[in-house]
Interface confidence: medium
């Protein structure tokens, strides 16, 4: 069966903002069957996962930047 | 209070299709996916598959696929399924049931809707 | 598919005594990217539709009494009802939310003696 990490939330708990020199790529999951809310989860530079608040203004200056990098899909 | 009101019980020819519906209450319909699950007479639960009402995304499984048909009208908050070819196989209790994929499960079910597939 | 094994079919048991059930699955239902079991336990009186007792395999849901239990991850699960109650006859379902296709055992049907 397919990986549960491509099918179901991933994010129980998000943060507010993380610092932009701390994250190595983002990924941005759309809502769909498999996940009902939008999830924005940061690799970071140590290799740990975190989950973002997509709403959160820091957050989305975060993905802006990252997408100007192209780090981020 | 959510509520999740299905439409009325069906008796059908063979061959034939049905629709059924499950009109949302309580909550914004399109926050949460609405899956649906068949229940044949007095046998365990079969996942149907599952629509997500704000994008109509859906997700079948393949034993379904090409028997179920998942749609939604977010102006009504209203979920439908229509089965097709129906057979005596079909014959069965169908539920409603919302969740969001986020480890909670499907945490409220509709009351459920016969379906009898008989000539 | 994940196919979902619960024992036993059904159980006779008197108000007041433990009851345990067992739930396995062909597949871990442990998500790897937060460390959670995706393992819910329904319970479903006659004539009514199943009702979400237990998510996160160990997650009372809101409103749910606290005689009820589940534990366990992996694959190996376990629902227990600490004090049985009549009301508490009925048919028990656990189900894997890990992967699709979502599937369901095939039950314990709860008898009171």
């Known amino acids: 069966a397919p990986l549960a990490t491509e099918l179901r939330c991933q994010c129980l708990q998000t943060l507010q903002g993380i610092h932009l020199k701390n994250i190595q790529s983002v990924k941005v999951k759309s809502p769909g069957p498999h996940c009902a809310q939008t999830e924005v989860i940061a690799t970071l530079k140590n290799g740990q996962k975190a989950c973002l608040n997509p709403a959160s203004p820091m957050v989305k200056k975060i993905i802006e930047k990252m997408l100007k990098n192209g780090k981020s899909n | 209070e959510f509520q999740l009101q299905q439409s009325g019980p069906e008796l059908v020819k063979p061959g034939a299709s049905v629709k059924i519906s499950c009109k949302a209450s309580g909550y914004s319909f399109t926050d949460y996916n609405m899956n649906w699950v068949k229940q044949s007479n007095g046998k365990s639960l079969e996942w149907i598959g599952v629509i997500n009402p704000k994008y109509g995304t859906t997700s079948y499984n393949q034993k379904f696929k090409g028997k179920a048909t998942l749609t939604v009208d977010q102006s009504s908050n209203t979920a439908y399924m229509q089965l097709s070819s129906l057979t005596s196989e079909d014959s069965a209790v169908y539920h409603c049931?919302?969740?969001?994929?986020?480890?909670?499960?499907?945490?409220?079910w509709g009351q459920g809707t016969s379906v009898t597939v008989s000539s | 598919d994940i196919v979902m094994t619960q024992s036993p079919s059904s159980l006779s048991v008197s108000a007041g005594e433990k009851v345990t059930m067992s739930c396995k699955s062909s597949q871990s239902l442990l998500n790897s990217g937060n460390q959670k079991n995706y393992l819910a336990w329904y319970q479903q009186k006659p004539g009514q539709p199943p009702k979400l007792l237990i998510y996160g395999a160990s997650t009372r849901k809101s409103g749910v009494p606290d005689r009820f239990t589940g534990s366990g991850s992996g694959t190996d699960f376990t629902l227990t009802i600490s004090s049985v109650q009549a009301e508490d006859l009925a048919v028990y379902y656990c189900q894997n939310d890990h992967s699709f296709p979502c599937t369901f055992g095939g039950g314990t049907k709860l008898e009171i003696k």
């Open positions: 049931a919302r969740g969001m994929g986020l480890l909670f499960g499907m945490d409220y």
